[in-house]
């Protein structure tokens, strides 16, 4: 069956340090269990997260995302997952892509994420 | 099961404040969207505002800019709509509602809080 | 601000009808357009998302078409149960509903 990738349509933002949540859904929802769920950086398709055969592939991952990322699942059955990215850097900043994989069907949608400086400030004056 | 269990009925004079909860259980709290809507005596839905409470920063509809603060509690996934200097129009019912993101569909609803605005 | 316009306000309908309620945008929305349904005393329930997306649950007697300015939600043949009041609501810019229609028996 055919399906749309949605994901945030304003960019998501995000302190360093801090954790950030990447929202992405099919439409129409159906359980995405049994998919290919995964999320990449253009333009060299980095791989941030990789879930497939129904379990995290970790040993897909770029190196400077092994251990800062989760993918959230509770979820997964009506096609909804989020990715938890902990510790965020600055070199996160700028666009991520999710993809959900059905057999040889696969869509995917663009996200972006700012990242901001917690202690950036401006002297009064 | 996602819920969202909002806090009892209120009675308010005019002039005042009322603050409602809006506790979630069952799912991600921190990165969906909680959106507020009210809905007057025989009238139909206005949504007031919302947070997604993993950002912190709420947005709200012009005509209740100034007058309506929507924050969120991440370590009690509670969120609360504080309306102030409340007149007889803001009788209404009370409604929270959960978007999967910003500007989604609203799949769960609380069970809505009735504010009565009386001298 | 994007005005959501629902027509008609309330439909005479009897069990077995097929019914059609419209909503128009001021703007286009792409399809970002959702249908609730409210009962008296309760909250609304989501019941299309996405112009034409079934939420899960949901009867398949409800469908929803269009995009743009112009969305449609039928209900093929109306059951006991679909006398309520209907709302569209887009979400392409914040949130607006439509005024509702209220699907009354005949």
């Known amino acids: 069956g055919q399906f749309r990738v949605i994901g945030p349509r304003h960019p998501i933002r995000a302190l360093v340090g801090d954790e950030v949540e990447l929202p992405c859904r099919i439409s129409p929802g159906k359980n995405a269990t049994g998919m290919e769920v995964g999320w990449y950086r253009p333009p060299f398709s980095r791989v941030v997260h990789l879930y497939r055969n129904g379990k995290d592939q970790d040993g897909d991952q770029a190196p400077e995302y092994r251990g800062r990322t989760e993918l959230l699942k509770d979820a997964i059955g009506e096609g909804k997952v989020t990715l938890r990215i902990r510790n965020v850097r600055f070199s996160d900043e700028g666009g991520f892509t999710c993809f959900f994989r059905d057999h040889s069907y696969q869509e995917e949608a663009a996200m972006e994420l700012k990242v901001e400086d917690p202690f950036y400030w401006v002297s009064p004056g | 099961q996602v819920q969202l269990v909002q806090s009892g009925a209120e009675v308010k004079k005019p002039g005042s404040s009322v603050k409602v909860s809006c506790k979630a259980s069952?799912?991600?709290?921190?990165?969906?969207?909680i959106s507020w809507v009210r809905q007057a005596p025989g009238q139909g839905l206005e949504w007031m505002g919302g947070i997604i409470p993993i950002f912190g920063t709420a947005n709200y509809a012009q005509k209740f800019q100034g007058r309506v603060t929507i924050t969120a509690d991440k370590s009690t996934s509670t969120a609360y709509m504080e309306l102030s200097s409340l007149r007889s129009e803001d009788t209404a019912v009370y409604y929270c509602?959960?978007?999967?993101?910003?500007?989604?569909?609203?799949?769960?609803w609380g069970q809505g809080t009735t504010v009565t605005v009386s001298s | 601000d994007i005005q959501m316009t629902q027509s008609p306000s309330t439909l005479s309908a009897s069990v077995g009808d097929r019914v059609t309620i419209t909503c128009r945008a001021s703007?286009?929305?792409?399809?970002?357009l959702a249908w609730y349904q409210q009962k008296p005393g309760k909250a609304p329930k989501l019941l299309i998302y996405d112009a034409s997306s079934l939420e899960s649950g949901v009867p398949s007697r409800f469908s929803g078409s269009g995009s743009g300015t112009e969305f449609t939600l039928t209900i093929s043949s109306l059951q006991p149960d679909d006398f309520a009041t209907y709302y569209c609501q887009q979400y392409d810019s914040y949130y607006t509903f439509g005024q509702g229609t209220k699907v009354e028996i005949k």
């Open positions: 069952g799912g991600t709290f921190s990165s969906y969207a």
């Open positions: 509602a959960r978007g999967y993101f910003s500007e989604e569909a609203m799949d769960y």
């Open positions: 703007q286009s929305i792409s399809s970002w």
